[in-house]
Interface confidence: low
């Protein structure tokens, strides 16, 4: 049998058949079903949903569907001892207290088990002190405070606005600045789009709405008590003092009604510039402490949350490949939510469900994919990507030998303006070709391709006539697959217009107001954007699992490697004197990139010409493509971040959500002018250039002719 016959690719069972089977109405129905009650990780409700999904995936026709459970560290508020923040007077009396819960949205007043807003993994504590406003609590914000304004945060409670960077980075920065507590709040400048009403009348954040979220700094470790290994029945667990990534100071989130009460009284220094002002009617004084008559008042935090080892459940579905069953294409997204999960994650989970149904329909008609497809419903993503990481730790040997690609499927929408894709350069051509074949759902682009509307609305900053595709960072379940294991990964969703809406994420992110009605009334009433995202995610999985030659183009990696080398070189060249003094050269890196470019070009030529009917040669060429991403993995990992092992990409050390290129070199150069031992610092830059150059050269050689 030829490969074509084995996978039964007939006109009835091609990509079009798979895509045509995807229905917006089904996604809508699944979203409704997944969002009627909360599905917090570690709760009975989320276990029941796992079993429901297992049962339905079996009905849809998958070969097997199993639950994979782990016992991981989670964090919950104390039900009888709520968390809050108060303003206290000189006598210690609480003259103002923040709210204990969000006012529930209409229709949900009688729903039980809505977890109140909290910062997951905050330690317990009741610190009191003067407040310092630290803007977004980014690295540069603390530089401004400490270096330019000479404001000392030591022993202070800091208040920071959500947005721009991952909240865990904010807490880490505050800890390093010596703060004894952190208050996080949503400023309307970031979470209230002008001209749009608050929920339930629109998609904006009301004053009582609060963003939940974890504040860990795991750096890819997974369960804080079992870094590197699965949290299984015989796991050895670290003591809590040795746990990875836990914050050391109390942290609590509030909405802008409560934030107004705290910020309104702030005295001390004026904000350094307009970028420190939000849109509340307060002066945004930095502090420390309150002004004038209020200078004797202090802020006190009351945090009583507990960390508990709790069982979580992933759902893993398998559709066995007909020709290469030992090659895995994975589609995964999480199931756990903070409350109802109207967008995060169930808009993604509903799309995965429909993709599984469509694949199952084809399978029932006798079709199989060429390669095995694994479908995953991850648990405890919101608590630090725990479900996906533990499963990957348990299955790392299989994955590193057999993993072709991972496609992530969290929230399908964060807006309804245009497509947003982050992926490995290996997938650029796949994404371009696929979106050229899909219809755009956008108004004004009737009859046009998705590629066309996407390129028009989100043009590439480098290449005319092409859409923007971003680097992978982290903050989602692809992390372990890409950053630790080196499996080619990608993600796609519909997003907002970043030019006109400069708020962070979507306003109701991680609040009680993220409901089915939010999506159905305001974001995607026809579910046409969800359908498009299903087509993109599903289409990528279909091609990756079914194309005879893997749809990876190694030449696109060559292009970006040159771009990243130019960028890091120009950063280093801001210090020409030191580069001369310490003999810092990038020649080895540029030489390796040049070699990679030439070898990738020759490999692509061979890929066009080889005999695809020879299964051994086909498998050999495909393996070279599959293992290219793996070749960028350094087994020793990045400095102080052993689970971030990809030499070309890592989550930014200053913002987990963002990707950084040549992260080892970047971090070595960061703030190098302030290092106490410049010789040692520039020595580390040289070492990182060496590691990067070696890795690029080694990766290039995997594409050379094998003998």
């Amino acid at each position: 049998k030829s490969s074509n016959e084995a996978t039964n690719i007939t006109p009835k069972h091609n990509m079009k058949a798979f895509l045509d089977e995807l229905k917006a109405e089904n996604i809508k129905k699944f979203l409704y079903n997944f969002t009627q009650i909360p599905h917090l990780a570690g709760t009975e409700q989320n276990f029941q949903l796992a079993k429901q999904i297992q049962s339905q995936w079996k009905e849809f026709g998958l070969d097997s569907v199993e639950l994979a459970h782990y016992d991981v560290l989670l964090s919950y508020p104390n039900k009888t001892h709520p968390n809050y923040i108060s303003i206290i007077n000189e006598d210690g009396n609480e003259i103002f207290n923040t709210s204990l819960f969000e006012p529930p949205p209409p229709g949900y007043e009688n729903v039980s088990d809505i977890v109140p807003p909290f910062s997951a993994f905050s330690p317990q504590g009741m610190p009191e002190g003067d407040l310092v406003y630290v803007n977004y609590a980014r690295t540069e914000d603390f530089f401004k405070l400490e270096r330019d304004m000479k404001i000392n945060c030591s022993g202070k409670i800091v208040i920071a606005r959500y947005g721009k960077v991952f909240r865990g980075n904010k807490v880490k920065n505050a800890q390093l600045a010596g703060a004894k507590g952190v208050i996080l709040y949503s400023d309307p400048a970031d979470y209230f789009a002008p001209g749009v009403k608050s929920y339930p009348d629109g998609w904006n954040l009301p004053g009582g709405g609060v963003q939940r979220g974890n504040i860990l700094n795991l750096n890819g470790a997974g369960d804080p008590l079992t870094p590197g290994y699965p949290a299984n029945e015989y796991a050895y667990r670290r003591g809590i003092a040795e746990a990875v990534g836990l914050p050391s100071i109390p942290v609590h989130p509030i909405g802008y009604y409560d934030a107004q009460k705290l910020l309104e009284k702030m005295g001390g220094s004026a904000p350094p510039d307009s970028s420190w002002r939000g849109s509340l009617k307060v002066p945004y004084n930095v502090g420390p402490g309150f002004t004038g008559n209020f200078s004797t008042q202090k802020v006190k935090m009351h945090i009583h949350s507990t960390n508990e080892v709790t069982r979580i459940y992933n759902v893993i579905g398998t559709l066995r490949g007909a020709v290469e069953p030992d090659r895995y294409v994975i589609l995964g997204g999480h199931r756990d939510s903070w409350v109802f999960g109207g967008i995060d994650p169930q808009s993604g989970a509903a799309v995965v469900h429909e993709i599984v149904r469509s694949f199952g329909t084809l399978k029932k008609e006798g079709w199989r994919p060429r390669r095995t497809i694994l479908f995953a419903s991850w648990d405890a993503e919101e608590f630090g990507l725990l479900g996906s990481t533990e499963w990957a730790e348990e299955n790392s040997r299989l994955l590193q030998e057999r993993g072709v690609a991972y496609i992530n499927a969290d929230s399908s929408i964060e807006g309804n303006y245009t497509l947003r894709v982050d992926c490995t350069p290996l997938m650029y051509s796949l994404v371009h070709n696929l979106t050229k074949e899909l219809k755009s759902p956008d108004e004004g682009f009737e009859g046009k391709s998705l590629y066309e509307s996407w390129t028009k609305k989100s043009p590439s900053p480098e290449f005319s006539g092409m859409p923007r595709i971003s680097k992978l960072g982290s903050g989602n379940d692809f992390e372990v697959f890409f950053q630790r294991l080196g499996i080619a990964s990608g993600r796609a969703r519909y997003t907002k217009n970043w030019e006109t809406n400069k708020f962070s994420g979507y306003p109701l992110y991680h609040s009680v107001y993220e409901t089915y009605e939010l999506v159905e009334k305001f974001y995607d009433p026809m579910f046409k954007y969800h359908l498009t995202v299903a087509q993109v995610r599903g289409g990528m999985v279909f091609e990756l699992a079914n194309s005879i030659v893997l749809p990876f183009d190694c030449r696109d990696y060559a292009v970006v490697l040159r771009k990243y080398a130019d960028k890091i070189y120009s950063i280093s060249m801001k210090h020409p004197q030191e580069m001369k003094t310490y003999s810092v050269s990038f020649d080895s890196l540029f030489s390796a990139v040049k070699n990679f470019t030439e070898i990738a070009s020759k490999f692509s030529e061979r890929l066009q010409d080889f005999d695809k009917s020879n299964p051994i040669v086909l498998r050999m060429m495909n393996d070279q493509l599959m293992f290219l991403e793996r070749a960028f993995i350094d087994p020793l990992g990045l400095p102080d971040r052993p689970f971030y092992r990809h030499v070309i990409y890592a989550p930014s050390s200053h913002n987990k959500y963002a990707g950084e290129s040549f992260p080892g070199i970047y971090d070595a150069l960061f703030d190098i002018e302030s290092k106490v031992d410049p010789s040692k610092a520039w020595g580390e830059v040289k070492r990182q250039i060496y590691v990067a150059a070696f890795t690029v050269q080694a990766a290039a050689e995997t594409l050379s002719e094998v003998a």
Epitope: P188, A189, F192, G207, Y256, Y257, Q260, E264, K265, G267, R277, G278, S279, L280, K281, V282, P283, Y284, F290, T291, G292, N293, F294
Partner: nanobody
């Protein structure tokens, strides 16, 4: 809905003082900022000053700085403008404004969708 009623206006000689009051009634909970504006004949409405809910933040325009003081008594739901060393150019209709919006360009930002009083006339003349 919030109703604002200004009082205390009148005719006064240059160099003398006057105290304006603005009583707020109705749904006053959640009024975060109150302010004074004035409009002289043939001119645009001009910002005079504002005060935040607790009185901890006050802002007065440069043209009246050092002469006018803004204050607020929350127990009486009343805003005050103490005007000293009055000048002829202070002649105008003085309006009280209140905002329950938490967001704006600045904390003392007001616009037409906020609450406004009818105004009280202040004439400074010898």
């Amino acid at each position: 809905q919030v109703q604002l009623v200004e009082s205390g206006g009148g005719v006064v000689q240059p160099g003398r003082s006057l105290r304006l009051s603005c009583a707020a009634s109705g749904r006053t909970f959640g009024i975060y900022v109150m302010g004074w504006f004035r409009q002289a004949p043939g001119k645009e409405r001009e910002f005079v000053g504002a005060i935040s809910w607790s009185g901890s933040n006050r802002k007065v325009s440069d043209s009246v700085k050092g002469r006018f003081t803004i204050s607020r008594d929350n127990s009486k739901n009343t805003l005050y403008l103490q005007m000293n060393s009055l000048r002829a150019e202070d002649t105008a209709v003085y309006f009280c404004a209140a905002s329950n919006k938490l967001y704006g360009r600045t904390w003392y930002d007001f616009n037409e969708s906020d609450y406004w009083g009818q105004g009280t006339q202040v004439t400074v003349s010898s």
